[in-house]
């Protein structure tokens, strides 16, 4: 008996071939011997089966001795043994119809779980293997679960159902709702304008929700809400903003915040959360601000950084075009009695300068100038 696998919702074509290459009488029946369709001369006739409106054949092939049964919009319950009667012969074909669906919406928040459920006919014992867009394989029986979805899980999942050494492939498009970056860090000199951007890693027709940026300044004992906003069809409207600092927010996506001035008291870490309509849970993006200040007080030239710096970073003070006078893994370095000239304060990571601030040291009788 030939086995054919079909996909729920698809169309399947079951073949039946006569030895004579001409149009002769044929019938297709199900296992209950109920006629599905056949022919009467060059006409297609249909029986009283449940498939009536979904069954068809290809009349153009009859002259070649081919009498296929075409079943459209397959259902799991179409799984059955189909018998083709032609030339006093019976050809049996076992059709097994499978369906694979995502448990919920195919738009899931980062960190949520994806469950894929296999619908299969009674008596079948299929195995399923799914490959994620990033190449990760998961195996299972009737259900497959992937916990903690990541951004790289967005895309087409390819699932193969194996039964009787035959296979059928399903493709499911999954969209993981997340920010493009889980975390970002902005390095600024004191007084510079700060731009925070929160690009989303997905596009949808309509995007509605609400968000908030909480900020934990390094110098503060507790975090505070800097801004709250609403999102309606990709339009941003600010609901509330703190007085200090006075943040500005762009009206369109991507979410964009401007801090007028980088100041030591603002250095720290923020967490932007976005709750989307009809979704449980929130999207998160961490943002960090590091602020540098170079100052000269009397005979002491000091360079300081505030904010979440890594212990691998090196802070240096050097006179322009000269060797570093001091270079330490600290958040503050200083030089006593600095010689006159343009001094550079550098925050670097393995040679990559992340932040630079220049300060001009004038001869001792003058006062310093900060460019």
């Amino acid at each position: 008996k030939k086995v054919v696998l079909g996909k729920k919702g698809d169309t399947v074509e079951l073949t039946c071939t006569a030895s004579q290459k001409k149009s002769i009488q044929f019938h297709w029946k199900n296992s209950n011997q109920i006629k599905i369709l056949g022919n009467q001369g060059s006409f297609l006739t249909k029986g009283p089966s449940k498939l009536n409106d979904r069954a068809d054949s290809r009349r153009s092939l009859w002259d070649q001795g081919n009498f296929p049964l075409i079943i459209k919009n397959l259902k799991i319950e179409d799984s059955d043994t189909y018998i083709c009667e032609v030339e006093d012969q019976k050809e049996e074909v076992q059709l097994l119809v499978f369906g694979l669906t995502a448990n919920s919406d195919t738009h899931l928040l980062q960190g949520q779980s994806l469950t894929l459920t296999l619908e299969s006919p009674p008596g079948s014992s299929p195995s399923v293997q799914c490959r994620s867009p990033r190449g990760k394989n998961i195996q299972g029986g009737k259900t497959l679960s992937v916990s903690q979805l990541e951004l790289q899980d967005s895309g087409t999942w390819t699932c193969t159902v194996l039964q009787n050494q035959k296979k059928v492939e399903f493709k499911i498009d999954i969209v993981v709702l997340a920010f493009q970056k889980a975390s970002s860090i902005v390095y600024k000199k004191e007084g510079e304008q700060v731009e925070f951007s929160f690009p989303l890693a997905f596009t949808v027709e309509k995007l509605t929700g609400s968000g908030e940026l909480w900020w934990q300044a390094e110098r503060a004992s507790s975090s505070k809400s800097w801004i709250t906003f609403d999102l309606k069809n990709k339009e941003v409207s600010v609901k509330r903003v703190t007085q200090d600092p006075k943040l500005q927010m762009g009206k369109k996506l991507p979410l964009h915040l401007t801090l007028p001035q980088a100041l030591p008291q603002y250095a720290g870490s923020g967490n932007l959360t976005l709750a989307l309509e009809a979704k449980t849970g929130k999207l998160h993006q961490e943002v960090n601000l590091v602020v540098m200040r170079a100052t000269q007080l009397q005979k002491n030239l000091t360079c300081e950084v505030w904010g979440p710096t890594s212990p691998k970073l090196m802070l240096s003070l050097k006179l322009e075009n000269k060797e570093a006078k001091v270079s330490k893994r600290e958040k503050a370095v200083w030089v006593l009695n600095p010689e006159a000239g343009m001094w550079q304060c550098l925050l670097s990571d393995s040679g990559q300068v992340l932040l630079e601030s220049n300060i001009k040291v004038l001869p001792t009788w003058s006062t310093p100038v900060q460019p």
Epitope: P311, S316, K328, R329, E330, A332, S348, S350, G351, Q352
Partner: antibody, heavy 117, light 113 residues
């Protein structure tokens, strides 16, 4: 697994230059600095400088300033250390080493440079 | 530059016994900003490059046997081999990476008594 593979031994005359290569594999080349450390026969370890694989920035020890040049080729994940105006006291094994924070977690096998007339 | 001084220059210890190597820096290598000691220990066997054993003064590199431990803070540091094995015969170096340039101690040769 990160690997640093250095070029073979060299014999040079005083006043000449030597160029030693160090090819990195098994890691993200651009995310760290490569340091050069030398060891004279029976002696301790001496730092020559580093080159950032990310952007080619260099930092040389004051002692070797003007005599040492470090370069990189990102297409082959290779860094080079050239030491000029060689003298007999430059005879040593030269090592390249990966630096993630300041300590050196992976080292090349070493290249013996002999300076002799 | 920070000067690193190791003691003793050489050390002979019986198999299974404890070996202790000291390292002193000319200035503190403890970062007040990050509360970390920027000190590493290396092992070097003849004809081989140095091998990282300990960093942050006391964090063991992965794959390093737990008989090796590092301690100390500020300017005084110790590498301890709790039970010396034959394969531990080598020269041991300390290195500071708190300030540039990084500097090494002169080395301590560990032998079997």
């Amino acid at each position: 697994q990160v690997q640093l593979v250095q070029s073979g031994a060299e014999v040079k005359k005083p006043g000449a230059s030597v160029k030693v290569s160090c090819k990195a594999s098994g890691g993200t080349f651009s995310s760290y600095a490569i340091n050069w450390v030398r060891q004279a026969p029976g002696q301790g370890l001496e730092w020559l400088g580093w080159i950032s694989a990310y952007n080619g920035n260099t930092n040389y020890a004051q002692k070797f300033q003007g005599r040492v040049t470090m370069t990189r080729d990102t297409s082959t994940s290779t860094v080079y250390m050239e030491l000029s105006s060689l003298r007999s006291e430059d005879t040593a094994v030269y090592y390249c080493a990966r630096d993630l924070v300041g300590h050196f977690d992976y080292w090349g096998q070493g290249t013996l440079v002999t300076v002799s007339s | 530059d920070i000067v690193m001084t190791q003691s003793p220059d050489s050390l002979a210890v019986s198999l299974g016994e404890r070996a202790t190597i000291n390292c002193k820096s000319s200035q503190s290598v403890l970062s007040s900003s990050y509360n970390k000691n920027y000190l590493a220990w290396y092992q070097q066997k003849p004809g081989q490059p140095p091998k990282l054993l300990i960093y942050w003064a006391s964090t063991r590199e992965s794959g390093v046997p737990d008989r090796f431990s590092g301690s100390g803070s500020g300017t005084d540091f110790t590498l301890t081999i709790s039970s010396l094995q034959a394969e531990d015969v080598a020269v041991y170096y300390c290195q500071q990476y708190y300030s540039s340039p990084p500097t090494f101690g002169g080395g301590t040769k560990v032998e079997i008594k």
